[in-house]
């Protein structure tokens, strides 16, 4: 039975050109983790393997850091950013957990977080 | 120590069908998203296809001369990779490799020496 | 579908810095790949991501990839480095190689 859930930054807002960390954080679960994959829409953003460590895609090589954790730091964002992130936590020997994201590039110098959510 | 070891090439009449095995050692081989490659007598290297791990999907891509024909899978279980190779023409004739894509910094394995498939009536 | 364009033949002389370029349309948004390969021999990775070196690898062999070029360098190149050289253009969808260049340490 999977028991865990999955913590995320919920929806969050920044200023285009600016940057922001995608953080999820997977709890009540003993679970191990095995690999994290960070997903828009169907594109994949990056990987972090816990044997291997990360792979960035190539498509955003040259914008998105690893970390800090299992989170992805998004830098130099366009207003093309805008929508939805997923982490996916594969685990054993729970399975596929998946958390949502949705992120707003704002052309304003207002950009406000929103709050934290849980997804069972 | 990372090693590759490709087996299963022969002589095979155009139209024919093969299946290619690689096993795989030294590594998590579960975790590694694997490709074929070929090289014709001569010739320079090319991309057959490829096949993601199951945490990425476990999905599949091939090069446009071999789509429809060619089928990759993988059992982790066994840590080998295969190639399905049906309806095979004479210019499939070439030394085949497995692959590993390079991904991950510390994992960037060597090649394989591969099997040559001569395809020939 | 997607191409690679490498010159079919590089001269250097011995100790001196060759440079192998490989051109593809928006090739600075995948990641390119380059192997060596020797006569009778399996090819070698030898830049992956860019510009990153397997252990192994001399510390002269470097890579680079922006706009549509990607190349390979070798400084102060040495006899052993006589070879083809194969650039790869990598993503998560699909992968070419070039047609390869041949190196001659004169």
């Known amino acids: 039975m999977m028991t865990g859930t999955i913590e995320t930054t919920g929806n969050i807002s920044a200023e285009k050109g600016g940057s922001i960390i995608l953080q999820c954080h997977l709890s009540s679960t003993t679970a191990q983790v095995t690999q994290v994959n960070w997903e828009q829409q169907d594109q994949l953003l990056a990987i972090c393997n816990a044997d291997l460590g990360w792979h960035i895609s190539p498509s955003f090589k040259d914008r998105v850091a690893p970390g800090p954790g299992l989170g992805l730091t998004l830098q130099s964002l366009t207003v093309n950013d805008t929508g939805e992130y997923f982490c996916i936590y594969h685990t054993y020997p729970d399975g596929t957990y998946t958390g949502r994201i949705f992120l707003e590039v704002l052309e304003s110098s207002v950009a406000e977080h929103g709050a934290r959510f849980q997804i069972p | 120590e990372v090693q590759l070891v490709e087996s299963g090439g022969g002589l095979v009449k155009p139209g024919g069908s093969l299946r290619l095995s690689c096993a795989a050692s030294g590594f998590t081989f579960s975790n590694a998203w694997m490709s074929w490659v070929r090289q014709a007598p001569g010739k320079g290297l090319e991309w057959v296809g490829r096949?993601?791990?199951?945490?990425?999907?476990?999905?599949?891509d091939y090069a446009a001369p071999v789509k429809g024909r060619f089928t990759i899978s993988r059992d982790d279980s066994k840590n080998t990779l295969y190639l399905q190779m049906n309806s095979l023409k004479t210019e499939d004739t070439a030394v085949y490799c497995c692959?590993?894509?390079?991904?991950?910094?510390?994992?960037?394995?060597?090649w394989g020496q591969g099997t040559l498939v001569t395809v020939s009536s | 579908p997607y191409e690679l364009t490498q010159a079919p033949s590089v001269s250097v002389s011995p100790g001196q810095a060759a440079s192998i370029t490989c051109s593809g349309d928006?090739?600075?948004?995948?990641?390119a790949c380059w192997y060596q390969q020797k006569p009778g021999q399996s090819p070698v990775l030898v830049i992956y991501?860019?510009?990153k070196r397997p252990s192994g690898i001399p510390e002269r062999f470097s890579g680079s990839n922006s706009g549509n070029t990607a190349t390979l360098t070798i400084s102060g190149t040495q006899a052993m480095d006589e070879a083809d050289y194969y650039c790869?253009?990598?993503?998560?969808?699909?992968?070419?190689f070039g047609g390869g260049t041949k190196l001659t340490v004169l």
């Open positions: 991501q860019d510009s």
């Open positions: 096949i993601k791990s199951k945490t990425n999907g476990g999905t599949t």
């Open positions: 928006k090739l600075g948004d995948k990641y």
């Open positions: 790869q253009a990598w993503d998560s969808s699909t992968v070419v």
């Open positions: 692959t590993i894509d390079p991904l991950y910094d510390i994992l960037t394995g060597p």
